[in-house]
Structure formats: C-alpha cells, structure tokens
Amino acid sequence: EEELQVIQPEKSVSVAAGDSATLNCTVSSLIPVGPIQWFRGAGPGRELIYNLKEGHFPRVTAVSDPTKRNNMDFSIRISNITPADAGTYYCVKFRKGSPDVELKSGAGTELSVRAKPS
C-alpha cells in the first residue's frame, strides 16, 4: 500500500496586502477516509485556519469543491490579506475517528505579506 503524501508544492508565497492568497495542497490518496484541516504554525499554539466540517472561517474558501467525490485537492484561498496573516501554513490530513487522528502534515507554505503598492 502506497504511503499517503500531503503535498504543499510551494515553500513560500508572497502576496500584497489586500489581495487574496492561494495556498495549494493535494493528497496522493483517497485512503484513509478523513478530513483535511489547515493550520498556521506548529506545536501547542498552532491556529486552526480552515476545517470543512465545522467552524466559521469567513475569509477562507476551498479552491475545489471538497465535498465532491474523489476530490484530492484541498487548496484554500484567504481573502483580504493583512500583515497579521503572515506565517507558515500547514495542510494536515486526519483519519476519521472519535476524535479524528492526525496522520500526516504537509511541509508547510510560508506566507509573506508585501505592502500594498501605492
């Protein structure tokens, strides 16, 4: 059985303040069943950025339809970027359970925010 890979192709992304940022993430397999969540940072303080299952994330949308059968693209778009959004973002695969169990994290994408051109 091929090991699941969580692929974040860009090591870094630079966006002008006020623009939208797209953070790409794909998985190499549909198995095992379970959600993808996006976090900023790692360790105790990592912040939940997007979770399809629950929560309210008004500035974050899925690029592809995550409810579509056989979807393997879990990229997100964050709108109206501000300097406070800078950081390293991780796409993380969980195995469905009670609670869900973290399986594998992508390598991370560092988002930097440029001043809005005048």
């Epitope: 900023r40 940072g41 105790p44 303080g45 990592r46 912040e47 939940l48």
Partner: antibody, heavy 117, light 108 residues
Framework: DVQLVESGGGLVQPGGSLRLSCTAS????????MSWVRQAPGEGLEWVSA???????YYTDSVKGRFTISRDNSKNTLYLQMNSLRAEDTAIYYC???????????WGLGTLVTVSS | EIVLTQSPGTLSVSPGERVTLTCRAS??????IAWYQQKPGQAPRLLIY???SRATGIPGRFSGSGSGTEFTLTITSLQSEDFAVYYC??????????FGGGTKVEIK
C-alpha cells in the same frame, strides 16, 4: 475583549488531586492553543502544559503522567486535572492563550494551588 | 531544552533613565523571543514577540532587539509604572517552552 478566568485552586494534601478550569471569552476558542503556566511563590514563570487547536497535548517533563490537560470547545473551557500532587507543585496557575507561533498573548489572573499537609 | 539566562537579576534605576535588559539563549533560536512584564499581584503582560515586534497597546518606549543567542529589551525614559519584573520566553522550540529567570527593575 479576550477574557480568561481560572478557578478550582485551593489547599490539597500531598498525593491529592485537584482540577483547574479556565473559561474563555472574546475569541473563537476552538481555533487556538491554550496553555497553563505556573509561578511558585517568589519564583519565576514555568510552562506546564498546552492543548493545541487540534487537540494535541503537550507537557513539561515534571508533570508528565500526573497532570492531564483537556478542553471542552462547546463550553469554551480549558481544564487541568492534577493528580499525585507534590509540595513543589504549589504555585499560582495561570491560563494563557497561545499564539500560532507559541508565545502567550493573553493571560488570566491565576488561581492558587497549595500542596501541604 | 533551551535555557534562557537573564541579566542582571535586579536593576536599581531612577525614573527617566534608559534601561537595557539582556536574555541569553543556550542555542540559536532564530529571533523567536518574547518579553513579558509582571507587576506584583498581577498576571504577566506580553510586551514584545519575535525579538522586536511590539504587542498591541504597548508604548513606544519599549523596544526589543537581538539575534542568534543574545537579545535585549530596552526601556527608554523609564516611567513609574514600568517598575516590575521582566521575563523573556523562547518560542522557537515547544518541547518545552521555556522562560528566563526574570529581571527585577526597582526604584533606586
């Protein structure tokens, strides 16, 4: 405004147990890491334990196997179950919100735990 | 474990003076240092993070600098409300997160 309110402290005998609570408001609790930091009388700050937004748990070596951190996102509450308490666990226990890159941006006022016979 | 050493342990200064507190790390921490102020009977308050970024609502007289293993907190023109204990904390390695022993800034 972010508010963190600790409760549950008190006097307990060595070997005893206590459960601390921290009720949070003013932010989306489930999305953020939360932590317990303690301060023994007249001493400095010591990080004790943390629970990430995804529910992962972290402990300092001296409390591993004795303390358990947990959270109830539906109640916006963080807990610290403390078992097999020792005199050296005597301290003010602060609840703190952890930022995405692991420092503490908001703190409660603390609750005093005294372990003594 | 990353050990943080703060110096001096106590600093006696007069209001209006400039104060520099030092925090040394036992290994490189890529500028991941935070500073807190704690007054008697109160919880700590975040002043600085990422070595030099001021937290929300912190006056401009507080500034942080440094890189590698040596970091400083500077208070220009010390005010009466600034007499307190100051702690540094590394946020580079979370196993475990560690604080320095503190520096007490007292009235001369």
């Amino acid at each position: 405004d972010v508010q963190l309110v600790e409760s549950g402290g008190g006097l307990v005998q060595p070997g005893g147990s206590l459960r601390l609570s921290c009720t949070a408001s003013g932010f989306t609790f489930r999305n953020y890491g939360m932590s317990w930091v303690r301060q023994a009388p007249g001493e400095g700050l010591e990080w004790v334990s943390a629970s990430s937004g995804s529910g992962s748990t972290y402990y300092t070596d001296s409390v591993k196997g004795r303390f358990t951190i947990s959270r109830d996102n539906s109640k916006n509450t963080l807990y610290l179950q403390m078992n097999s308490l020792r005199a050296e666990d005597t301290a003010i226990y602060y609840c703190a919100k952890v930022t995405w890159n692991n420092f503490f941006d908001y703190w409660g006022l603390g609750t005093l735990v005294t372990v003594s016979s | 474990e990353i050990v943080l050493t703060q110096s001096p342990g106590t600093l006696s200064v007069s209001p209006g003076e400039r104060v520099t507190l030092t925090c040394r790390a036992s290994q490189g921490i890529a500028g991941k240092i935070a500073w807190y102020q704690q007054k008697p009977g109160q919880a700590p308050r975040l002043l600085i993070y990422d070595a030099s970024s001021r937290a929300t609502g912190i006056p401009g007289r507080f500034s942080g600098s440094g890189s590698g293993t040596e970091f400083t907190l500077t208070i220009t023109s010390l005010q009466s409300e600034d007499f307190a204990v100051y702690y540094c904390q590394q946020h580079y390695d979370w196993s475990p997160l560690t604080f320095g022993g503190g520096t007490k800034v007292e009235i001369k």
